[in-house]
């Protein structure tokens, strides 16, 4: 399978997740109880497959509304957790461009 054009990966993925999830933070692998199918992890989902805003939202650490699922503990950080300072240099325009591209 070849990578489709509408993918997000690398720093652009981290930037876009930071924008979409805001101060909720995000998981690098979705808690299994939050999805009907087996979670592949965001790298598998977004780096190689078409990745949209709805999919990105499922990786946010807390639901956007108040119905937080307290039965779902945060996942343990994998050993591929990024060394970059996530969100340290907030550049709204960069994230806005990425999310606009995903909406198309």
């Amino acid at each position: 399978a070849y990578r489709p054009s509408e993918t997000l990966c690398g720093g652009e993925l981290v930037d876009t997740l930071q924008f979409v999830c805001g101060d909720r933070g995000f998981y690098f692998s979705r808690p299994a109880s939050r999805v009907s199918r087996r979670s592949r992890g965001i790298v598998e989902e977004c780096c190689f497959r078409s990745c949209d805003l709805a999919l990105l939202e499922t990786y946010c650490a807390t639901p956007a509304k108040s119905e937080r699922d307290v039965s779902t503990p945060p996942t343990v950080l994998p050993d591929n957790f990024p060394r970059y300072p996530v969100g340290k240099f907030f550049q709204y325009d960069t994230w806005k461009q990425s999310t606009q591209r995903l909406r198309r």
């Epitope: 720093g11 780096c47 190689f48 994998p78 591929n80 970059y84 550049q91």
Partner: antibody, heavy 119, light 108 residues
């Protein structure tokens, strides 16, 4: 300690085939995108191909598309590159590297394996 | 695809010199820029990541700066072991990470 060890290089005639391997240890292999990078003699570094953590998805540089196939065996912590229809311009040192998918650098490299395509 | 350019392609310098290498991206990559050193017959070695963060074990005479599209690697006081090739790499968009063409630092 993270280690990547490439093997399988050698001398092959144009049109021939080779299979490179990269044995990984010291990290959770199945969590990473794995990548092949090559360097022709006296030239710069060129990305060749990458494979998703599960092995279900692949992507290739235009220069090798249709000729090279990347694969992995997560049970053996090993990455492969099947190289067919080799050309003189494929002559290079081939390196494997791990990619977190989160914008990290390639912090560990193997020693590389030399592929020479010549008649 | 994001294209990376580097300048100069080569330079001659003496031990103790201050050396500056520049790298430019074809679009903004924020701070997702890494620098590597490579000596003949060896694999590349990570020097700096996230544009300015020094990798563990790398001497403090190496420094990096920049954000967006323009980046700089500086060697404050060139040492004999620093004569090598240097490559920049963007990791803002991956897979398909791209490298600069390299800068060869030679002895004057």
């Amino acid at each position: 300690e993270v280690q990547l060890l490439e093997s399988g290089g050698g001398l092959v005639q144009p049109g021939g085939s080779l299979r490179l391997s990269c044995a990984a240890s010291g990290f959770t292999f199945s969590a990473y995108i794995m990548t092949w990078v090559r360097q022709a003699p006296g030239k710069g570094l060129e990305w060749v191909s990458s494979i998703s953590p599960s092995g279900g998805y692949t992507v290739y540089a235009d220069s090798v598309k249709g000729r090279f196939t990347i694969s992995r065996d997560n049970s053996k912590n090993t990455l492969y590159l099947q190289m067919n229809s080799l050309r003189a311009e494929d002559t290079a040192v081939y390196y494997c590297a791990r990619d977190s998918g989160f914008g990290d650098p390639f912090d560990y490299w193997g020693q590389g394996t030399m592929v020479t395509v010549s008649s | 695809d994001i294209q990376m350019t580097q300048s100069p392609s080569s330079l001659s310098a003496s031990v103790g010199d201050r050396v500056t290498i520049t790298c430019r991206a074809s679009q903004s990559i924020r701070n997702y820029l890494n620098w590597y050193q490579q000596k003949p017959g060896k694999a590349p070695k990570l020097l700096i990541y996230a544009a300015s963060k020094l990798e563990d074990g790398v001497p403090s005479r190496f420094s990096g700066s920049g954000t967006g599209t323009d980046f700089t690697l500086t060697i404050r006081s060139l040492q004999p072991e620093d004569f090598a090739s240097y490559f920049c790499q963007q990791s803002y968009s991956s897979p398909g990470i791209t490298f600069g063409p390299g800068t060869k630092v030679e002895i004057k």
